[in-house]
Amino acid sequence: TQNKALPENVKYGIVLDAGSSHTSLYIYKWPAEKENDTGVVHQVEECRVKGPGISKFVQKVNEIGIYLTDCMERAREVIPRSQHQETPVYLGATAGMRLLRMESEELADRVLDVVERSLSNYPFDFQGARIITGQEEGAYGWITINYLLGKFSQKTRWFSIVPYETNNQETFGALDLGGASTQVTFVPQNQTIESPDNALQFRLYGKDYNVYTHSFLCYGKDQALWQKLAKDIQVASNEILRDPCFHPGYKKVVNVSDLYKTPCTKRFEMTLPFQQFEIQGIGNYQQCHQSILELFNTSYCPYSQCAFNGIFLPPLQGDFGAFSAFYFVMKFLNLTSEKVSQEKVTEMMKKFCAQPWEEIKTSYAGVKEKYLSEYCFSGTYILSLLLQGYHFTADSWEHIHFIGKIQGSDAGWTLGYMLNLTNMIPAEQPLSTPLSHSTYV
């Protein structure tokens, strides 16, 4: 591919998503002469970096270079050598690094420093690593899915090709679930966004959008599980925690020091008379659901309505794309079909959680036990978050579309991030000539 007689007039961009549980590298490609057109950028590669999220390297920063090598070398292979020097590389770190920064700004800076040292040694145009805000994460996820769905285009292009096309220009809301945070972003219907922190104004392709967004730090699936364990161990009579969110017969020893390592469990921290405790699964969806609901404070709301923890949430409006862990978990549970009602999802979760651990291990022999053991919790958490947290109902459930990819590109914040940083989302409808940089978002 590197020796074409007539090179295509294309450009490439690389974004690394440094999430709390892992890092993924995405390579995007677009025709150089169509930079300002909507929907021309597409993903050509995803490379999942082997290992944990970058925040876990805080005591072993010397290993970061090796950690990133395979995927960066993959990028070197995929992108023609002649394009290397003009290919921008961006790294955005999300809630895992936000949490590390809350604990120690210096430790977070040390990790980012070494990440930048590592990435700048490649032949690309490295544009820096940074911790993106929760608001940015929500906004860029919203931009990504609507860009890929053709919602910013004046023509209803891709009608009948895009599976979620509703034959109108009404944007989709974005629901993103990570390991350490979750984001909800959508355009409310003629509703004032009562809290300024949750309001975004965009002008994209000649149209104004008033967007609501919020990122709930500590409410990603992994941190939510730590929160639940910290809450439940408070009332355990001994070092055994009988947990309804794990399959019957499942056992796991947890170090109390690991439990209290994250800022997300600080509110539940107490001196315990043991250093370790054992989770013993009892596999009961209803009890698991009840336990999860205790993580959402719904007793206080200073606005006309709230999601939870006193955070403003306007009435839900339109269709939503639910991606990242919303999709991965529901896909594993075989619950992503548009035809599966919320009641059916709940029924299937009840059955799944009640299945004995030995049976589950046999049925899913190829899946790592660490991940396999947590699907009951994660599935229940997704239902709790969407129904009680965000106030979806059995009726509005059908407006949630669990999306992995759209037109071959992963749904997530990375594409929107790159489109913005490369000035590829014009404020006005592009004419024949590109607009000056000052007019971009």
């Epitope: 010397n62 420093d113 040292r117």
Partner: antibody
Framework: QVQLVQSGAEVKKPGSSVKVSCKAS????????ISWVRQAPGQGLEWMGS????????NYAQKFQGRVTITADESTSTAYMELSSLRSEDTAVYYC??????????????WGRGTLVTVSS | EIVMTQSPATLSVSPGERATLSCRAS??????LAWYQQKPGQAPRLLIY???TRATGIPARFSGSGSGTEFTLTISSLQSEDFAVYYC?????????FGGGTKVEIK
């Protein structure tokens, strides 16, 4: 109080190599990075590269890539800069400088006195 | 790489007067900019970092401002010891880069 003490002046022949040292006296590198900056006679400052001892791998300006090697010995709190294939244009004062901190704190809060390297046949 | 451009190359100022030095970056460096002073035969000395924060021991007559691509170093009332060459340096992205310098000389 930490000082950066550099090795003495050198006169080198074109085509040869030079290795300049920079020792943190009165302290250690204490997890700080060391950059090398050069200044040709009557010219401005030119960043050559940097090493963070706890990371080990150096970063270089593209202009010097392949010709410069920056290393650090944590046990002696000494950084080294080796420049090969010397030419007359490499005649300059070579400074080591400590980076103030990590990430966005890569400015230089402590400088060595400089080492004059003269390349002449 | 980010190109740093300083202007003017030379600034002639009388003692007691105000000196304003400019530094422009070829792309945004946010507020990640440092200023150094260098006197003949000496190593540079850090004056300002983060665009506007004075380094330890730097007199209050030195002030920095700006963000993004345009930066200014102001010396409010020049003292005899301030006549020197001043360099800006971006500390946002690799490779780290310096401006070409501004020589402040006695008028």
């Amino acid at each position: 109080q930490v000082q950066l003490v550099q090795s003495g002046a050198e006169v080198k022949k074109p085509g040869s190599s030079v290795k300049v040292s920079c020792k943190a006296s009165g302290g250690t590198f204490s997890d700080k990075a060391i950059s090398w900056v050069r200044q040709a006679p009557g010219q401005g400052l030119e960043w050559m590269g940097s090493i963070l001892p706890i990371f080990g791998t150096a970063n270089y300006a593209q202009k010097f890539q392949g010709r410069v090697t920056i290393t650090a010995d944590e046990s002696t709190s000494t950084a080294y800069m080796e420049l090969s294939s010397l030419r007359s244009e490499d005649t300059a004062v070579y400074y080591c400088a400590r980076e103030a901190g990590y990430y966005r704190y890569r400015y230089f809060d402590l400088w060595g006195r400089g080492t004059l390297v003269t390349v002449s046949s | 790489e980010i190109v740093m451009t300083q202007s003017p190359a030379t600034l002639s100022v009388s003692p007691g007067e105000r000196a304003t030095l400019s530094c422009r970056a070829s792309q945004s460096v946010s507020s990640n900019l440092a200023w150094y002073q260098q006197k003949p035969g000496q190593a540079p000395r850090l004056l300002i970092y983060g665009a506007s924060t004075r380094a330890t021991g730097i007199p209050a007559r030195f002030s920095g401002s700006g963000s993004g691509t345009e930066f200014t170093l102001t010396i409010s009332s020049l003292q005899s010891e301030d006549f020197a060459v001043y360099y800006c340096q971006q500390h946002a992205l690799w490779p780290l880069t310096f401006g070409g310098g501004t020589k402040v000389e006695i008028k």
